[in-house]
């Protein structure tokens, strides 16, 4: 196993809407074809996988039907879309990549990107 | 995945044994090869990149088995030389096809059996 | 290269019983795991992928379950077409590796 840089942006707000988006970028050594990335969250001192794809350069990443996760490939950059995001989800979302083909098999965690999610007021009722 | 049909080789011969692609674009999915000998399992062989065409194999049959693949007919090639009578298996090309985190092989050929026998 | 072990080697069941068919890897390879079913002169046709999630066009009669270095898959009630061979496959690390398979025939 080789280690690989991954860097990801420090602070991220979710939407009104409960969606946080940011860019996982890894530096590949070589010329790796297919790709796997995991998000995983960190909250109090616990981890938790929250999507992971395997895809092949070029292709669409595609997460399991029931992910809270999408995504879209570019070069050696990642842009993931978490949705149905609320308070309580606000944590340390890490990215993991790891360059499964051709060999060697390299693996890169990245320092983690601070979620905040803050829950919409609810409306007041009208008067009107 | 329409496989080429059934071959007798004698030992010392060699077998090459196409793989035709349809109904996908050919350039987005790995293949691989797989054989199976006579009440066996399934062994790995290898893999080839139908973009580039970048291969690799199995350690077991390095320097005798040779992939290839031909993008104007969409068509894949496993190649193995050297034959001798512990070869004698079905040969499968297979997709491979990822969902979520987890890869799998989806759709296969019929399979190519191939008898080493003098 | 990950060995895959999968017991038993052969079983004998009856249509209706309920079947219980083992994997396990020699590290653990998460939930990265596939199932297959062969039936005599045919391609292996998949069943189950990433240790649970059920391929498309199979009966639900089929599940999974596991991750780490046990899975299992069973069958709640048997059918006649069930009678095959069935084998395990990781797909955590290069290269894929299968078990060496379980029969499943009538008792």
């Known amino acids: 196993c080789k280690a690989m840089h991954v860097a990801q942006p420090a602070v991220v707000l979710a939407s009104s809407r409960g969606i946080a988006s940011f860019v996982c970028e890894y530096a590949s050594p070589g010329k790796a074809t297919e790709v796997r990335v995991t998000v995983l969250r960190q909250a109090d001192s616990q981890v938790t996988e929250v999507c992971a794809a395997t895809y092949m350069m070029g292709n669409e990443l595609t997460f399991l039907d029931d992910s809270i996760c999408t995504g879209t490939s570019s070069g050696n950059q990642v842009n993931l879309t978490i949705q149905g995001l609320r308070a309580m989800d606000t944590g340390l979302y890490i990215c993991k990549v790891e360059l499964m083909y051709p060999p060697p098999y390299y693996l890169g965690i990245g320092n983690g990107t601070q979620i905040y999610v803050i829950d919409p007021e609810p409306c007041p009722d009208s008067d009107f | 995945l329409v496989q080429s049909g059934a071959e007798v080789k004698k030992p010392g011969a060699s077998v090459k044994v196409s793989c035709e692609a349809s109904?996908?674009?050919?350039?987005?999915?790995?293949i691989h090869w797989l054989r199976q000998a006579p009440g066996q399992g399934l062994e790995w062989m290898g893999i080839?990149?139908?973009?580039?065409?970048?291969?690799t194999y199995a350690q077991k049959f390095q320097g005798r088995i040779t992939m290839t693949r031909d993008t104007s007919t969409n068509t894949l090639y496993m190649e193995l030389s050297s034959l001798r009578s512990e070869d004698t298996a079905i040969y499968y090309c297979?997709?491979?096809?990822?969902?979520?985190?987890?890869?799998?092989?989806?759709?296969w050929g019929q399979g190519t059996t191939v008898t080493v026998s003098s | 290269s990950i060995v895959m072990t999968q017991s038993p080697s052969s079983l004998s069941a009856s249509v209706g019983d309920r079947v219980t068919i083992t994997c396990r890897a020699s590290?653990?390879?998460?939930?990265?795991l596939n199932w297959y079913q062969q039936k005599p002169g045919k391609a292996p046709k998949l069943l189950i992928y990433?240790?649970?999630s059920l391929q498309s066009g199979v009966p639900p009669r089929f599940s999974g379950s596991g991750s780490g270095t046990e899975f299992t898959l069973t069958i709640s009630s048997l059918q006649p077409e069930d009678f095959a061979t069935y084998y395990c496959?990781?797909?955590?690390?290069?290269?894929?590796?299968f078990g060496q398979g379980t029969k499943v025939d009538i008792k």
């Open positions: 297979a997709r491979r096809d990822c969902r979520g985190p987890s890869c799998y092989f989806a759709y």
């Open positions: 109904g996908y674009t050919f350039t987005n999915y790995y």
């Open positions: 080839i990149n139908p973009s580039g065409g970048s291969t």
């Open positions: 590290q653990s390879i998460s939930s990265y």
């Open positions: 990433a240790a649970s």
């Open positions: 496959q990781q797909a955590n690390s290069f290269p894929p590796t």
